[in-house]
Interface confidence: medium
């Protein structure tokens, strides 16, 4: 995985370039869970979606998220998360026309209905961490990651490379 300086450098580079008009290189339908195996779930309420972090029983169906993968157009100088020297970014959509968005003002993660091209707030730099975990860094705010806080998703500032492996910003992707 990248050190934090590398993360910030590439995110800044990405911030300077627009990728919103580019088609995804691949898509992957997966359930999303925390490092501690709590499930990320989505519920429709009053015509909007709420995001939850829940303990689910074995027979309770996990919600799926469509991850669309994009390549940055900036070559990588460091090894780690790059694909052929490029950074991977993702958008996350739990249901048609809704995408996870970073609300940097409120330090929150929200689901917004929107049309393509998607805004920058819907893009996250994908980092492959240890133990088959990933983390999601805001395209719009270098060093800020999707994390778990008080049983909700929130934006969490990571200010050192050691904190990149903090459990509350690590997520697992599973096809089941």
């Amino acid at each position: 995985a990248f050190g934090i300086s590398g993360v910030q450098k590439y995110t800044r580079a990405l911030h300077d370039s627009s990728i919103t008009g580019i088609s995804p290189i691949t898509e992957y339908l997966a359930s999303l869970s925390t490092y501690n195996d709590q499930s990320i779930t989505f519920a429709l309420e009053d015509e909007s979606y709420e995001i939850y972090v829940e303990d689910l029983k074995k027979d309770e169906k996990k919600d799926k998220v469509l991850l669309s993968y994009y390549e940055s157009q900036h070559p990588s100088n460091e090894s780690g998360d790059g694909v052929d020297g490029k950074m991977l970014m993702v958008t996350l959509s739990p249901t048609k026309d809704f995408w996870l968005h970073a609300n940097n003002k409120e330090h929150s993660v929200e689901l917004h209905k929107c049309e393509k091209p998607l805004p920058d707030q819907a893009f996250f730099v994908l980092h492959n961490m240890h133990s088959n975990c990933v983390s999601f860094e805001c395209k719009t705010d270098p060093g800020v990651f999707i994390g778990v806080k008080d049983n909700h998703l929130a934006l969490i500032k990571v200010d050192s490379s050691e904190n990149l492996c903090t459990e509350n910003i690590l997520f697992k992707l599973s096809e089941t």
């Epitope: 519920a43 939850y52 689910l56 029983k57 027979d59 169906k61």
Partner: antibody
């Protein structure tokens, strides 16, 4: 930690009404169906009423249909059971239990401690 | 309505012994069966769901099996805290129904 705490049980006369409450915590209440189950002293368990996570649909056995009404307040994480036209055979400990998650799963992973309703003149 | 017949109604056993409780449905319930334990203070705990899935935190000496109309709960080696009432429940079809219960007592 998941908790369900029932209250409202009392001694009431036949024909009268009583309302039970179940305050919940430790899980996302509005994502789960909820159920009331009762147990006559020294006897077995009987399903009494169920309600969907939104409150949009309710289910009852014939023994209480038309007399009991299950409801919920998702903003307060609270389940209710309104019991009208009470009969002596309604004397029981009433338990609330967390039912299925809105789209899947099996019921009754968690139960309250119960509240005793005694119907007697 | 689906009837659940639980047997035996009372079971006397010794510590360390293996015991099995049976639950028979009046029609197929497709593994939609739960086993509960009720302690003397009234506390109810789910042990097994989907006929054979062990609830997290429940000791592995408990196991459930069965299909169609015939189901069973087994305890491989009885411990003192296992002496209690046991109930099965079918949740295949409304109205959901419970078995009559089995009282497991110390011989």
């Amino acid at each position: 930690e998941v908790q369900l705490v029932e209250s409202g049980g009392d001694l009431v006369q036949p024909g009268r009404s009583l309302k039970l409450s179940c305050v919940t915590s430790g899980f996302i209440f509005k994502n789960y169906w909820m159920t009331w189950i009762r147990q006559v002293p020294g006897k077995g368990l009987e399903w009494v009423a169920s309600i969907t996570n939104t409150g949009g649909a309710t289910y009852y056995p014939d023994s209480v249909k038309g007399r009991f009404t299950i409801s919920r307040d998702n903003s307060e994480n609270t389940l209710y059971l309104q019991m009208n036209s009470l009969r002596s055979e309604d004397t029981a400990t009433y338990y609330c239990a967390r039912d299925r998650r809105y789209n899947s799963g099996s019921p009754f992973a968690y139960w309250g401690q119960g509240t005793l309703v005694t119907v007697s003149s | 309505d689906i009837q659940l017949t639980q047997s035996p109604s009372t079971l006397a056993a010794s510590l360390g012994e293996r015991v099995t409780i049976s639950c028979r449905a009046s029609q197929s319930i497709s593994n939609s069966l739960i086993w509960f334990q009720q302690k003397p203070d009234g506390t109810i705990k789910r042990l097994i769901y989907s006929s054979s899935t062990l609830e997290s935190g429940v000791p592995s000496r408990f196991s459930g099996s069965g299909s169609g109309t015939d189901y069973s709960l087994s305890i491989s080696s009885l411990e003192s805290e296992d002496f209690a009432m046991y109930y099965c429940l079918q949740y295949a079809t409304y109205p959901w129904t419970f078995g009559g219960g089995t009282k497991l007592e110390l011989r």
